[in-house]
């Protein structure tokens, strides 16, 4: 674009150099050249000469009009055709931008990843604005009434050291650009309720050589949270359908989960946990792939009908990926109940 240009005249834009996309725009060029009475005044957009909707207002001034200007950025300049000059003479130039006022930020979420020392807040920004947009995160203590503000671009990490005076906060986000401002809904946050346990990791898996082979998956976390509720999902690599098992976990020792799986098949396992009774889940752990042993007996084991686990498994359900391109986006299909209660209602969040 044109950042600094020595003008021999002026160029101005109505309604302004930054305007709402789709508006009608008039750009004026006024020459103040010495020793020149211009025959013509020309407009260029992004280096290309414009041919239409140009009006000569008087000897020194011309206007170009755009109906429904919809380019996010353009650089405009105008020139004069001076008698006796072979080349056109530059008058002035301007960068112009069009965009949208921001949408109200939505889906504001704040979490504290265990051991991180930060409260991380994220939100959906809505449709693109095409112009520079700032986000101001407001954090107001419900106990002391003190308010802090943080400037952000798409998320913010706030040190928990600056949240010492209180446990309960009101958080909201303001989206601001030169075309407008919108506020998100306010989020009530209790610091003790938004902690996500330290990452859970599947460390290894083994399949026994028993008559009815079983697969034992070992998994762990460094969390200090005592009551943790976890889900493990698993499927064959060729399948779209996940099975999900739920566990109450105590990470003072390595967790062991037993599965009766199809022999000679490659399975993918993932685990995620949350503090029991809270709403924020860890992301799913990295996929852990395990190959079950070849079949020794004749029985073809069905993972949905086998006598399940001796560990305190609560529920098994089946979910399926909506498309092979989005394996993390899941949809509840059916639930097989092993401990007398249905699968948690959170499966639409999987991924």
């Amino acid at each position: 674009g044109i950042t600094s240009i020595n003008c021999s005249g002026d160029m101005w834009v109505e309604p302004g150099e930054i305007f709402q996309m789709g508006m009608n725009v008039s750009i004026y060029c006024q020459e103040a050249l010495k020793h020149c009475r211009p025959r013509n005044l020309y407009f260029y957009k992004n280096g290309f000469k414009e041919e239409f909707d140009i009006t000569r207002i008087n000897r020194t001034t011309a206007r170009i009009w755009y109906k429904g200007f919809s380019e996010p950025h353009a650089y405009m300049h105008c020139t004069a055709e001076c008698p006796g000059h072979f080349q056109e003479t530059l008058i002035c130039g301007k960068d112009i931008s069009s965009g949208h006022p921001p949408d109200a930020p939505s889906n504001l979420t704040c979490v504290i990843y265990e051991y991180s020392g930060n409260m991380t807040c994220t939100w959906n920004t809505g449709k693109p604005t095409y112009i520079d947009t700032k986000y101001i995160v407001h954090v107001k203590s419900l106990e002391t009434e003190e308010e802090q503000q943080y400037l952000a671009s798409s998320y913010v990490k706030i040190s928990t050291d600056s949240l010492q005076g209180s446990r309960k906060y009101l958080v909201w986000v303001q989206a601001v650009n030169s075309l407008g401002m919108e506020n998100s809904q306010q989020l009530h946050v209790h610091l003790d309720d938004i902690v996500i346990p330290s990452a859970s990791i599947i460390s290894r898996a083994e399949t026994t050589n028993d008559t009815v082979p079983k697969t034992i998956v070992y998994w762990k976390s460094k969390t200090m949270i005592e009551k943790v509720f976890c889900e493990m999902r698993y499927k064959t690599t060729t399948n779209q359908t996940w099975s999900v098992k739920e566990f109450d976990a105590n990470f003072t020792y390595v967790q062991q989960s037993e599965f009766y799986l199809e022999p000679d098949s490659k399975y993918v396992f993932q685990v995620r946990c949350q503090e029991t009774g809270k709403r924020n889940w860890q992301p799913w752990s990295s996929p852990f792939v395990h190959q079950t042993s070849q079949e020794t007996g004749k029985r073809n084991w069905q993972p949905w009908s086998s006598p399940f686990v001796h560990q305190t498994s609560q529920t098994v359900s089946q979910v399926t990926a909506k498309s092979s391109h989005e394996p993390q986006k899941m949809e509840m299909l059916s639930a097989t109940i092993f401990r007398g209660h249905p699968a948690s209602g959170n499966h639409q969040d999987i991924g």
């Epitope: 101001i136 943080y150 400037l151």
Partner: nanobody
Framework: QVQLQESGGGSVQAGGSLRLSCAAS????????MGWYRQAPGKERELVSM???????FYADSVKGRFTFSQENAKNTVYLQMNSLKPEDTAMYYC??????????WGQGTQVTVSS
């Protein structure tokens, strides 16, 4: 850490003008996104105007066309020219320096009182 000092407040009749100044000191000033904010008694602090980027400024609807934000980089100073003042503009005015991911730093504020 940046320090901010506002000046230029005072009492004025409705329809009058004031020019607020905010002088910044401290090495982080150049990375600041500068803004003017105000807080009327019993109300939340609200954003009045903010320099979004070069050539782009936000103005709250209530002040559009009456207030003008400007800056003088050589002096590390920003200004808020307030024309056609109204009684509802009465508030404590603060300038703020916001840097990405950091807590916004405020000045001490300057009082503006508009009487009818």
């Amino acid at each position: 850490q940046v320090q901010l000092q506002e000046s230029g407040g005072g009492s004025v009749q409705a329809g009058g003008s004031l020019r607020l100044s905010c002088a910044a000191s401290g090495y982080t000033y150049s990375s600041c996104t500068m803004g003017w904010y105000r807080q009327a008694p019993g109300k939340e602090r609200e954003l009045v105007s903010m320099l979004i980027s070069d050539g782009s400024t936000f103005y709250a609807d209530s002040v559009k066309g009456r207030f003008t934000f400007s800056q003088e980089n050589a002096k590390n100073t920003v200004y808020l020219q307030m024309n056609s003042l109204k009684p509802e503009d009465t508030a404590m005015y603060y300038c703020g320096c916001a840097t990405l991911g950091s807590r916004t730093v405020w000045g001490q504020g300057t009082q503006v009182t508009v009487s009818s």
